[in-house]
């Protein structure tokens, strides 16, 4: 997948909203570096973007694979194994809107509480509706049953 | 095409102060988290600061802590990189580099401005 | 922070043949909830920026010659040009972006 060209959306994950937008004179950077933005802090700030940019790449890997004039690159790609074999059937399950029920309570949240996690937060902010219109499209459209049959052949141990 | 194109280098006596420009062009700048990356020939690469699309997150190496301020102006497609109290081991060529999808992750960089700290 | 550490420091290599450039990380850089390494490899060409080649420690950028493959995972990590072209001298860097971005010193890649 390129990362290149691929218009960032509902991906900020913001750890903090001290900062105005305009450059803050000297007295209100000494503020901030106070109340801590230093490596530790950003370590943070990326721990919590970590799964969500993960989630956004698949969006996006999804939505060029449903552009039919990327498919041919698509194939060779595969072909050539730099194409992550996991991405489509994760794409599916994660994002299916009628399998979170299921993943919450049956064996998903026993098996695979990082997986659980993520579909909840899906199922939050589609909830409070701060998820974009383009995921609940994709949600509408997509399939539970390749993510059930990948999750009953993929062991645990191969995934972790 | 995505271009950055940097401005605001050059030679600076030690305590001074130099502003760096960072031009943004060839996609949409307010969606993309940016930084700045320095290259001494000491040093190497360093990552030295960091700010989110709009503006609400901002993080810095621990050595350019209370002297370096980053900011944006995502109606002016521009970065910017404020930096007070420079010393010698500030010298080296700044890049301004375009976070990609993934967090830290740097897909584009501009050729970079040449600061140098010197009596 | 974690320290990233290159191995050799310069490597010459003869044209169409291969070349190989490790990297170590200080501490894994292996995210377990999508089984992804944070580590990329970037080309830095004389008086040009560095260029992102491969990210998630083996996914190609797009645009980059086929060539070019990445492999390891945890703490270890390989870059590998198959068959070296001229065009292909340059430094190249690892860089982990699983925690505050830090950067390997570089290997020079030069033609024997």
């Known amino acids: 997948r390129s990362l290149q060209d691929t218009e960032e959306k509902s991906r900020s994950f913001s750890a903090s909203q001290a900062d105005p937008l305009s450059d803050p004179d000297q007295m209100n950077e000494d503020k901030r570096h106070s109340q801590g933005t230093f490596t530790s802090d950003y370590s943070k700030y990326l721990d919590s973007r970590r799964a969500q940019d993960f989630v956004q790449w698949l969006m996006n890997t999804k939505r060029n694979r449903n552009n039919i004039a990327k498919r041919h690159d698509e194939f060779e790609r595969h072909a050539e194994g730099t194409f992550t074999s996991d991405v489509s059937s994760y794409l599916e399950g994660q994002a299916a809107k009628e399998f979170i029920a299921w993943l919450v309570k049956g064996r998903g949240r026993r098996d695979f509480p990082e997986e659980v996690a993520i579909v909840e937060e899906l199922g939050r902010r589609h909830a409070d509706g701060s998820f974009s219109d383009e995921m609940n499209t994709i949600l509408d459209n997509l399939a539970a049953r390749d993510f059930i049959n990948w999750l009953i052949q993929t062991k645990i141990t191969d995934r972790k | 095409q995505v271009q950055l194109v940097e401005s605001g280098g050059g030679v600076v006596q030690p305590g001074r102060s130099l502003r760096l420009s960072c031009a943004a062009s060839?996609?949409?700048?307010?969606?993309?988290?940016m930084h700045w990356v320095r290259q001494a020939p000491v040093k190497g690469l360093e990552w030295v600061a960091f700010?989110?699309?709009?503006?609400?997150?901002?993080y810095y190496v621990d050595s350019v802590k209370g002297r370096f301020t980053i900011s944006r102006d995502n109606s002016k497609n521009t970065l910017f990189l404020q930096m007070n109290s420079l010393t010698a081991e500030d010298t080296a060529v700044y890049y301004c580099a375009k976070e990609s999808i993934l967090a830290a992750l740097f897909d584009y960089w501009g050729q970079g401005t040449l600061v140098t700290v010197s009596s | 922070d974690i320290v990233m550490t290159q191995s050799p420091d310069s490597l010459a290599v003869s044209l169409g043949e291969r070349a190989t450039i490790n990297c170590k990380s200080s501490?894994?850089?292996?995210?377990?909830?999508?089984?992804?390494?944070?580590l990329a490899w970037y080309q830095q060409k004389p008086r040009q920026p560095p260029k992102l080649l491969i990210y998630w420690a083996s996914n190609r950028e797009s645009g980059v010659p086929d060539r070019f493959s990445g492999s390891g995972s945890g703490t270890d990590f390989t870059l590998t040009i198959s068959s070296l072209q001229a065009e292909d001298v340059a430094v190249y860097y690892c860089q982990q972006f699983y925690s505050v971005p830090t950067f390997g010193q570089g290997t020079k890649l030069e033609i024997k």
């Open positions: 060839g996609f949409t700048f307010r969606t993309y988290g």
């Open positions: 501490q894994s850089v292996l995210y377990s909830s999508n089984n992804k390494n944070y």
């Open positions: 700010i989110s699309k709009d503006g609400s997150d901002k």
